[in-house]
């Protein structure tokens, strides 16, 4: 069972009065309609809350919507909507906020129907002042900052054309017309896909590949017979037609676009799709839809090249295109990722993979947990956890799993312990090594949040009925609290922390309704009290992330390292404070052949570590090509594994094989492309 | 089956120093942290710190910060404790545990094996 | 640091009794106590970890239990062997001792 709430284990002294000191509530006057909130800038105390109510009338829509400034991160707020001249906002729009602490957000207004053009708000000053501008097209899409610049904005509008700005959305200027999709890609490089006949949707496998470096003064088109395209890490994907049938496949080029690789993946036909699931600098998961409407395909890392793939894991969930997939990215321990798979039986499975990738496993059974009432064996079972696929079936599910780059090791999520997942009610289970074992933390489904990098976490039941508790912890979720935080009940719509998960603030945002009227109201709780000293040195304790085996020599080594991290003790209840850094010691492990991906060419027959070579694959050339690297293609087999460290140990030397007269591939060649010039 | 063995007892002048050892064999000495625990005559345990081998990260007890060192060589598998300015309360049997360990953490598991005990008599 | 506190300090029992030992942490440590037999002249011998874990090759009749700040060590059925000086530790962090009970023939 989940331990105990305001039992003796963990009991913070005299933490009724200090959280109602430092408990503010907010009355929205405002009928309730929707509510969006964002927080501009980090550690600036800054939120925008946006209110927009909706009556359908006959023959058109009345809209009203209001503008909310805080900059004591929710504790007051005030209502600066005549900074927009009271102007009704598109919620669909969101509020577009900088990169970073640019200070800059843009607010996309409703227009009337006849106008030339839609109308923007700009602010670069944190949302104190708003300028309006009037723009030359009707925007389809929010504005997007270039990540490199933030007065660089590029949009799409509805007639499909690319509109760029140069001083933060002050004087717009179209680029190019009969536009698909664009991207900023590095250094203010846009990338975009571009149609000739009828539109996106009737040129799609036909489009073209297109890029400018320097805002629209010269093109460079660096791919055709395009699908689509997308970025991850330092790669740029793009899905290519066949030349002979209606199959597609993946090119991936590392120079923006220059020069281009065929990705060693299998082709996919009309009704199937790739994603890429997860991509930094070194390596790429990518997802391959099986044939058939199946709801699962395949997922595959790449090499350092994103060229060479090895299969990862079979069978894994993703239902269509722009569907619901559980892949997850443990941001709280390096090489970890959790993901789903619908097995033989047809039921959901999670799966847990610590080596990025490398091999996947079930999660372990929490200790002292039984197996539900859907298991076959009371005694085997494991841990099942409920991510989107489970969210967009609606079962009782109010949020995805969780974790913080800066709060190590900590993983929370609902979950089910049984053969698979189960429809039967969740509980909250909590992980503080990165998900190698597991611990139910609260019974039943709740929200929850993690404040000071770990050294708080706070959670709210999911309840239809009006709830005015709030859970806290603040041993990594081993004993709780409960707070009451208001006399009168709300309906809770939901919990809002500064992203980051720096902050000791957290404000439950809720409705109130009464017999005519309902508003919006939020309360804000400021944990500083609470952890009222900061953490020194002998409040925290060393510990080995992925260690499994202390008598292993190369115990906690993934990736060809291992990492020791000073982690807070969990009986020490302070600060981490906002400006928390995560202090770890790697140290280099030996290589083993595990370090190592077979390359093109080659494969690791079952159980076995060695990478022999493929047989001739049947007197067929192998697809796969490197554009004017062809002295590149030579291989002893073994490649390793992207962002693997180790040094010493085994070292796979063998003969140095030349690849060259096997290599095909039917991808455009340099002599296919070309520059423009505006 | 781990075993661990410390130096010889040692008599020492107040106001110098004691070095003892203490040597692992039979485990991977590196994967688990090193305690050194002082018990004087009659009285009970009190911990002076550990070290753990892989980085050598070491932490003391707030009543001998400054004055106590503790070192591992991995090439040998061996920790050292040293104690600076000797006094005659310092008179005690020391010894060095094995901090046993299930998870990542170091120190989270009590300690499962300990040596034999060094006297240091501290006398002028 | 956080101060333990152990009680009875002294404890007489016979064989077969049922003893029972108490530790006390000046603030919450969790599970994470360990108890330890000593027997003179010799070095402390591990338990009990993470409070109620028992380590192995140690007799089924010591058990643990606790959370929190308030911690037990139960010996169901006291053997001749079993006479010596039991300490607790908390081991969060900075490791400090309780100060011993000893269990001597009655």
């Known amino acids: 069972s989940a331990p105990g709430e305001d039992e003796e284990c963990g009991r913070v002294r005299d933490f009724v009065a200090k959280l109602a000191n430092n408990t503010h509530q907010h009355v929205f006057d405002d009928l309730r309609g929707s509510v969006s909130l964002s927080w501009v800038g980090d550690s600036t105390g800054v939120i925008l809350v946006l209110t927009t109510f909706h009556v359908p009338l006959v023959i058109m829509t009345f809209g009203q919507s209001k503008l909310y400034r805080s900059e004591d991160y929710g504790k007051n707020f005030k209502d600066i909507t005549d900074l927009i001249n009271n102007t009704f906002i598109r919620t669909e729009f969101g509020m577009a906020i900088g990169p970073e602490n640019s200070g800059k957000v843009v607010l996309t207004a409703e227009v009337s129907g006849g106008s030339r053009g839609g109308r923007i708000f700009r602010s670069s000053d944190f949302a104190k002042n708003f300028v309006q501008t009037d723009l030359p097209f009707h925007p389809l899409t929010q504005m997007m900052y270039s990540p490199q610049n933030s007065d660089y904005l590029l949009a799409l509008s509805t007639e499909n054309g690319l509109w760029v700005s140069k001083n933060f959305g002050g004087k717009w200027e179209e680029i190019h017309k009969a536009v698909c999709l664009a991207k900023w890609g590095s250094d203010n490089t846009i990338f975009f896909t571009t149609y000739a006949n009828g539109s996106c949707k009737a040129d799609l496998g036909a489009l073209e590949l297109w890029r400018t470096s320097d805002l629209g003064k010269s093109f460079k088109t660096i791919g055709v017979k395009i699908y689509s395209f997308g970025l991850g890490g330092r790669f740029l994907f793009a899905s290519v037609m066949a030349d002979k049938d209606t199959t597609r496949r993946i090119h991936v080029s590392t120079d923006q676009g220059d020069t281009w690789s065929m990705a060693q993946l299998p082709s996919v036909g009309q009704e199937q799709f790739y994603s890429i699931l997860a991509a930094n600098d070194d390596m790429v998961f990518m997802h391959v839809d099986e044939p058939g409407d199946t709801g699962f395909g395949t997922i595959f890392t790449s090499d350092d090249r994103g060229i060479v793939y090895s299969k990862s894991l079979d069978r894994h969930l993703y239902t269509t295109t722009g569907g619901e997939t559980d892949f997850t990215n443990v941001t709280s321990l390096r090489g970890v990722y959790i993901t789903s798979v619908l097995s033989e039986d047809n039921s959901i499975q999670t799966m847990i993979t610590f080596d990025q990738g490398g091999r996947w496993t079930h999660l372990r059974k929490p200790e002292n947990s039984e197996c539900d009432a859907t298991a076959k064996n009371k005694n085997e079972c494991s841990l099942h956890i409920h991510a989107s696929y489970s969210i967009s079936q609606k079962l009782n599910v109010p949020m995805a799993p969780l974790s913080e780059p800066n709060a190590v090791g900590i993983v929370i999520a609902h979950g089910s312990v049984a053969d698979a997942i189960s429809v039967m009610v969740p509980d909250v289970y909590i992980s503080d090594d990165g998900g190698y074992s597991w611990t139910k933390m609260l019974e039943g489904p709740h929200y929850y949040t993690i404040l000071d990098s770990g050294g708080i976490i706070v959670a709210i039941e999911h309840s239809s009925r009006p709830i005015n508790v709030i859970k806290f912890s603040t041993d990594e979720g081993q004993c709780w609290q409960t707070y009451t935080f208001t006399r009168d009940p709300i309906y809770f719509t939901g919990l809002a922390s500064e992203p980051g998960a720096r902050s000791m603030n957290i404000s439950i945002w809720g409705f109130t309704e009464s017999f005519l009227t309902s508003q919006w109201v939020s309360y804000t709780i400021d944990f500083k009290d609470i952890l009222e000293r900061n953490c020194e040195e002998k409040d925290y304790t060393i510990w080995l992330a992925h260690s499994t085996d202390p008598e292993d020599y190369e115990d906690g080594c993934i990736l060809g390292y291992k990492e020791q991290f000073l982690r807070l003790r969990k009986s020490s209840v302070c600060q981490n404070g906002r400006d928390y850094v995560v202090t770890k010691q790697p140290s280099i492990c030996l290589c083993s052949l595990e370090d190592f991906l077979c390359d093109f060419g080659y494969y690791r027959p079952e159980n076995d570590s060695k990478c022999v070579e493929q047989p001739e694959l049947k007197g067929h050339d192998l697809e796969f090509c490197l554009y004017g690297r062809e002295e590149h293609l030579t291989t002893n087999g073994y490649r390793k594994i992207p962002g693997d460290k180790c040094q010493g140990g085994v070292n796979p030397v063998r003969e140095v094989k030349d690849l060259k007269k096997k290599c095909t591939s039917n991808f455009l060649s340099p002599e296919k492309q070309n520059s423009k010039s505006n | 089956q781990v075993q661990l063995v410390q130096s010889g007892a040692e008599v020492k002048k107040p106001g110098s120093s004691v070095k003892v050892s203490c040597k692992a064999s039979?485990?991977?000495?590196?994967?688990?942290?090193i305690s050194w625990v002082r018990q004087a005559p009659g009285q009970g345990l009190e911990w002076m710190g550990g070290i753990i081998p892989i980085g050598g990260w070491a932490n003391y007890a707030q009543k001998f910060q400054g004055r106590v060192t503790i070192t591992a060589d991995e090439s040998t598998s061996t920790a050292y404790m040293e104690l600076s300015s000797l006094r005659s309360e310092d008179t005690a049997v020391y010894y060095c545990?094995?901090?046993?360990?299930?998870?990542?953490?170091?120190?989270?598991?009590?300690?499962?094996?300990w040596g034999q005990g060094t006297t240091v008599t501290v006398s002028s | 640091d956080i101060q333990m506190t152990q009680s009875p300090s002294t404890l007489s029992a016979s064989v077969g009794d049922r003893v029972t030992i108490t530790c006390r942490a000046s603030q919450s440590i969790s599970s994470w106590l360990a108890w330890y037999q000593q027997k003179p002249g010799k070095a402390p011998k591990l338990l009990i970890y993470k409070a109620s874990s028992l380590e192995s090759g140690v007799p089924s009749r010591f058990s643990g239990s606790g959370s929190g700040t308030e911690f037990t060590l139960t010996i169901s059925s006291l053997q001749p062997d079993d006479f010596a000086t039991y300490y607790c530790q908390q081991a969060d962090g900075h490791i400090t001792f309780g100060g011993g009970t000893k269990v001597e023939i009655k």
């Open positions: 039979g485990g991977t000495f590196r994967n688990y942290a």
């Open positions: 545990a094995r901090q046993g360990r299930k998870t990542g953490y170091y120190y989270y598991y009590g300690m499962d094996v």
